[in-house]
């Protein structure tokens, strides 16, 4: 007899886009409308919750812009939280200082992406230093991952 | 009897590099020579044509440079076109303003990468705002994807 | 009789982080402690050594910063070396010029990532133009790959 048909497992993947009603850290994300993906991973209060241990490629882009450049330091972090550990773990980070000409309208992006070994119940978040300078267009600011 | 040997499916993947004879939008790409990859995906008039629905990681980098900075706004977009939809969909975008010191020689890159659910017959393209400021070296300006 | 249980092959993956005792090129990497991954790939004198031919997504981020900007040109390269070829092949490269205000404290990142067809015994390295301007925090400067 032929072997039973292979059960095609759903790919664990997420692509969340900017949500302009973020008021504090971590950033909140659009998880329903537009070019969003969420499969085999949960979204909870700004975080992607891993439900299967394994290797994941995690990425994020944040689009910063302003009208009168003051060169406030910008930071963009992807970090991990797990109830087993007392402290957040910064997985990836980008920083910018002295990036525009004083007083000018300016715009700049930060991109992060890398592979991590994640454990079931890990919560992943994105943090930025200057929330008021983030533009949340879905094509410009996003956060995602997929299981290798 | 043992099951038939598994037919290893060709990975759907593309990595195209800058082509300096691009004269208008969308950008055109080198699809034959150098460190180019094109397998299970077609290249047509600047676009990558999807022939199998599924999840894809899509990425692009563009290298902008100039002899005398005048801070023209720069944009770098990856967008999708499908005959079923009336309008292009911007999947990812990077913008830069006030990024160099007036009059100086300057150079800057924009990188984009994320996961999308693509449908057979989707065409993916890259657009930039200032074609004359793009350098097309194969290591500096590229466009690619792979099916997860 | 049922077919033998599938032998789950170990995923070929690496994520190496910045090592501040890099003294010359190529950059050296932390391959043991922290959020490091190294499986099915070898690390040797700054390089990731491929032991199985195939398609790989390769990425790197470098975090440059300085106390007093003088706009030294910055470059960040991922290149490949193989004893069969006389010359290094630059796979990906980022360059920056005129990126900060003279005399100011500054910080900037360069990110690279793309798919390549690599061959067993290929050695992959990262090179930067100004080693003294690199910050080696594990979340800020890294180098990795995974087999598709």
């Amino acid at each position: 007899p032929s072997p039973p048909p292979e059960k095609k497992e759903l790919r664990k993947v997420a692509h969340l886009t900017g949500k302009s009603n973020s008021r504090s850290m971590p950033l909140e994300w659009e998880d329903t409308y537009g070019i969003v993906l969420l499969s085999g991973v949960k979204y909870k209060k700004g975080g992607l919750v891993i439900n299967e241990t394994g290797l994941y490629f995690v990425y994020s882009k944040v689009y910063f812009r302003g009208q009168s450049c003051n060169n406030l330091p910008l930071s963009h972090k992807v970090y991990m939280r797990n109830s087993k550990y007392p402290q957040d773990l910064v997985m990836m980070e980008g920083k910018m200082m002295s990036y525009c000409t004083t007083g000018q309208m300016w715009a700049r992006s930060s991109y992060l992406g890398a592979v991590f070994n994640l454990t079931s119940a890990d919560h992943l978040y994105v943090n930025v230093s200057e929330l008021s300078l983030v533009n949340f267009e879905e094509s410009q600011t996003f956060f995602g991952l997929y299981k290798l | 009897p043992s099951p038939p040997p598994e037919k290893k499916e060709l990975r759907k993947v593309a990595h195209l590099t800058g082509k300096s004879n691009s004269r208008s939008m969308p950008l055109e790409w080198e699809d034959t020579y150098g460190i180019v990859l094109l397998s299970g995906v077609k290249y047509k008039k600047g676009g990558l044509v999807i022939n199998e629905t599924g999840l894809y990681f899509v990425y692009s980098k563009v290298y902008f440079r100039g002899q005398s900075c005048n801070n023209l706004p720069l944009s770098h977009k990856v967008y999708m076109r499908n005959s079923k939809y009336p309008q292009d969909l911007v999947m990812m975008e990077g913008k830069m303003m006030s990024y160099c010191t007036t009059g100086q020689m300057w150079a800057r890159s924009s990188y984009l990468g994320a996961v999308f659910n693509l449908t057979s017959a989707d065409h993916l393209y890259v657009n930039v705002s200032e074609l004359s400021l793009v350098n097309f070296e194969e290591s500096q300006t590229f466009f690619g994807l792979y099916k997860l | 009789p049922s077919p033998p249980p599938e032998k789950k092959e170990l995923r070929k993956v690496a994520h190496l982080t910045g090592k501040s005792n890099s003294r010359s090129m190529p950059l050296e990497w932390e391959d043991t402690y922290g959020i490091v991954l190294l499986s099915g790939v070898k690390y040797k004198k700054g390089g990731l050594v491929i032991n199985e031919t195939g398609l790989y997504f390769v990425y790197s981020k470098v975090y440059f910063r300085g106390q007093s900007c003088n706009n030294l040109p910055l470059s960040h390269k991922v290149y490949m070396r193989n004893s069969k070829y006389p010359q290094d092949l630059v796979m990906m490269e980022g360059k920056m010029m005129s990126y900060c205000t003279t005399g100011q404290m500054w910080a900037r990142s360069s990110y690279l990532g793309a798919v390549f067809n690599l061959t067993s015994a290929d050695h992959l390295y990262v090179n930067v133009s100004e080693l003294s301007l690199v910050n080696f925090e594990e979340s800020q400067t890294f180098f990795g790959l995974y087999k598709l």
């Epitope: 009208q67 003051n70 060169n71 004083t102 | - | 100011q104």
Partner: antibody, heavy 119, light 111 residues
Framework: QVQLVQSGAEVKKPGASVKVSCKAS????????IHWVRQAPGQGLEWMGV????????SYNQKFKGRVTMTVDTSTSTVYMELSSLRSEDTAVYYC????????????WGQGTLVTVSS | EIVMTQSPATLSVSPGERATLSCKAS??????????MNWYQQKPGQPPRLLIY???NLESGIPARFSGSGSGTEFTLTISSLQSEDFAVYYC?????????FGQGTKLEIK
């Protein structure tokens, strides 16, 4: 509440310099650039330049290049605008105004400082 | 630099009536879906006061009788029903690029 308080009126001779101060309170000083705008008697508004309160460097209107210097003292949340080689046509009210980087316009202004240049 | 031209120089209107002030820019002040045009009101002996930002957005605390419109190079400030406290000088200003530039002003006076 947000306040920008400028120094008092000045009378200067042609060729001299004047230094006007603008002290900020009621908000996080280093989060906003400070712009300087002047207004000659019975005339319109003229933008002079802007200073980064965080970084301390400035961008100036080309018209005043070489004559205007803007500085910042973060310890006292004060910005200074110095104009040198004064001439009679520099007689004006000088205003400082803050500009939120995330917004579109100068939202709070100082009360103005009248500088009179006369021999 | 971008030159801003306001018209008319003086506008005489009766209280309760509608006032329409115009501002033209020598080049577009639009970028990325926004118009970088602001309107200020100035009364004698006082600093300018922000009324409208980004062409059509009412600054907090400004009465709803003030409205702005336009894009590209042509902009309008409208006061729907003039109150006695509205008689002042009005300036348009572009914040699209440095140097910021102002119009020469429109004086709104009681008819």
């Amino acid at each position: 509440q947000v306040q920008l308080v400028q120094s008092g009126a000045e009378v200067k001779k042609p060729g001299a310099s004047v230094k006007v101060s603008c002290k900020a309170s009621g908000y996080t000083f280093t989060d906003y650039t400070i712009h300087w705008v002047r207004q000659a008697p019975g005339q319109g508004l003229e933008w002079m330049g802007v200073i980064s309160t965080y970084q301390g460097d400035a961008s100036y209107n080309q018209k005043f290049k070489g004559r205007v210097t803007m500085t910042v003292d973060t310890s006292t949340s004060t910005v200074y605008m110095e104009l040198s080689s004064l001439r009679s046509e520099d007689t004006a009210v000088y205003y400082c105004a803050r500009f939120p980087d995330w917004d579109y316009a100068m939202d709070y202004w100082g009360q103005g400082t009248l500088v009179t240049v006369s021999s | 630099e971008i030159v801003m031209t306001q018209s008319p120089a003086t506008l005489s209107v009766s209280p309760g009536e509608r006032a329409t002030l115009s501002c033209k820019a020598s080049q577009s002040v639009d970028y990325d879906g926004d118009s970088y045009m602001n309107w200020y009101q100035q009364k004698p002996g006082q600093p300018p006061r922000l009324l409208i930002y980004a062409a059509s957005n009412l600054e907090s605390g400004i009465p709803a009788r003030f409205s702005g419109s336009g894009s590209g190079t042509e902009f309008t400030l409208t006061i729907s029903s003039l109150q006695s406290e509205d008689f002042a000088v009005y300036y348009c200003q572009q914040s699209r690029e440095l140097p910021y530039t102002f119009g020469q002003g429109t004086k709104l006076e009681i008819k």
